[in-house]
Amino acid sequence: IIGPGRGFGKRRHPKKLTPLAYKQFIPNVAEKTLGASGRYEGKITRNSERFKELTPNYNPDIIFKDEENTGADRLMTQRCKDKLNALAISVMNQWPGVKLRVTEGWDEDGHHSEESLHYEGRAVDITTSDRDRSKYGMLARLAVEAGFDWVYYESKAHIHCSVKAENSVAAKSGG
């Protein structure tokens, strides 16, 4: 039985996307709560056992700032990588000729606040490759649509996105 609104011939309108406002975050709860990206599980360093949980992202459709020249910004958890790759496609579709740019990924330098998800490869700060800040509100919305677990229009200069830990996702899906 075809339910209401599911009949043949009905045109599907693409979802109208509204940009996030400066300082807005989605979902509207704190980043490290259960309804968003979940708790901080501990800093990952290059010589820690958990370093193997991080995977490099060599997607050619993503620009990495890599200010440290160490490749650290490319390292992230698999879930973060999956969401980022999905977002990269959305960005190119939204703005032809423009790519997704990552300014911060995994951080080993201690730049970020205590218990930042950057320290375990679960957070990225992103911009567009043209660094046109008038696009960042919509970039944040695209990040929400791409499936990031928490998206924050944190700064005039970037959008902060984070994901749940791999184990919490696996437990939920029964994997």
């Epitope: 200010e67 020249n69 730049h111 911009t127 660094r131 800040r133 700064s155 005039k156 200069a157």
Partner: antibody, heavy 123, light 105 residues
Framework: QVQLQESGPGLVKPSQTLSLTCTVS??????????WSWIRQHPGKGLEWIGS???????YYNPSLKSRVTISVDTSKNQFSLKLSSVTAADTAVYYC???????????????WGRGTLVTVSS | SYELTQPPSVSVSPGQTASITCSGE??????VSWYQQKPGQSPVLVIY???KRPSGIPERFSGSNSGNTATLTISGTQAMDEADYYC????????FGGGTKLTVL
């Protein structure tokens, strides 16, 4: 606390290369997040950013000076340096070294400054 | 290249509020800093990140930035605030405004 001190010749001949060094004391130049910078001020005029260097070696230069400027860092000596080639009288200025911090994506602000050193270009 | 425009001079009576403007295209999308420079001295950062005050800077200094204009406000201006003030914004290339001479009458 962190302090910056410029050093170098106060007089340079036209067409020569101006060379200045900034010594950082009270902290490591290797600290992430800082952009070690040079800024100059012509006599009685405003401030002009020359360029900045990150501890990793990445450099950023004022487009109007880029062809003549080289900024380098020596982490072992906790120093960074400025070289400005083919100088003319128009390069006569007080040269400041400064520590830049990043508000965002190259949104620098300069929170620490050296005392400045006057460099005169004259034959 | 990007340009920031400031009025060359601003005058204020002691105890009054001084406002110094800085304008540039889409300046509201950038972070603005302000520096105070007294004769013969190095510049001192008084405002960064549009409206943040470094430690040691009096509360009478405040900043705002939206649209194409940033403003440095000095409330209850004192004689010691007489100086040159420079706005600055960055975008892979730090740019300074031309400076404003604040005179406390």
């Amino acid at each position: 606390q962190v302090q910056l001190q410029e050093s170098g010749p106060g007089l340079v001949k036209p067409s020569q290369t101006l060379s200045l060094t900034c010594t950082v004391s009270g902290g490591s130049i290797n600290s992430g997040g800082f952009y070690w910078s040079w800024i100059r001020q012509h006599p009685g005029k405003g401030l002009e950013w020359i360029g900045s260097i990150y501890y990793s070696g990445n450099t950023y230069y004022n487009p109007s000076l880029k062809s003549r400027v080289t900024i380098s860092v020596d982490t072992s000596k906790n120093q960074f340096s400025l070289k400005l080639s083919s100088v003319t009288a128009a390069d006569t200025a007080v040269y400041y070294c400064a520590r830049g911090q990043d508000s965002g994506d190259y949104d620098w602000y300069f929170d620490l400054w050296g005392r400045g050193t006057l460099v005169t270009v004259s034959s | 290249s990007y340009e920031l425009t400031q009025p060359p001079s601003v005058s204020v009576s002691p105890g009054q509020t001084a406002s110094i403007t800085c304008s540039g295209e889409k300046l509201g999308y950038k972070y603005v800093s302000w520096y105070q420079q007294k004769p013969g001295q190095s510049p001192v950062l008084v405002i960064y990140h549009d409206n943040k005050r470094p430690s040691g800077i009096p509360e009478r200094f405040s900043g705002s930035n939206s649209g194409n204009t940033a403003t440095l406000t000095i409330s209850g201006t004192q004689a010691m605030d007489e100086a040159d003030y420079y706005c600055q914004a960055g975008d892979s290339s730090a740019v300074f405004g031309g400076g404003t001479k604040l005179t406390v009458l």
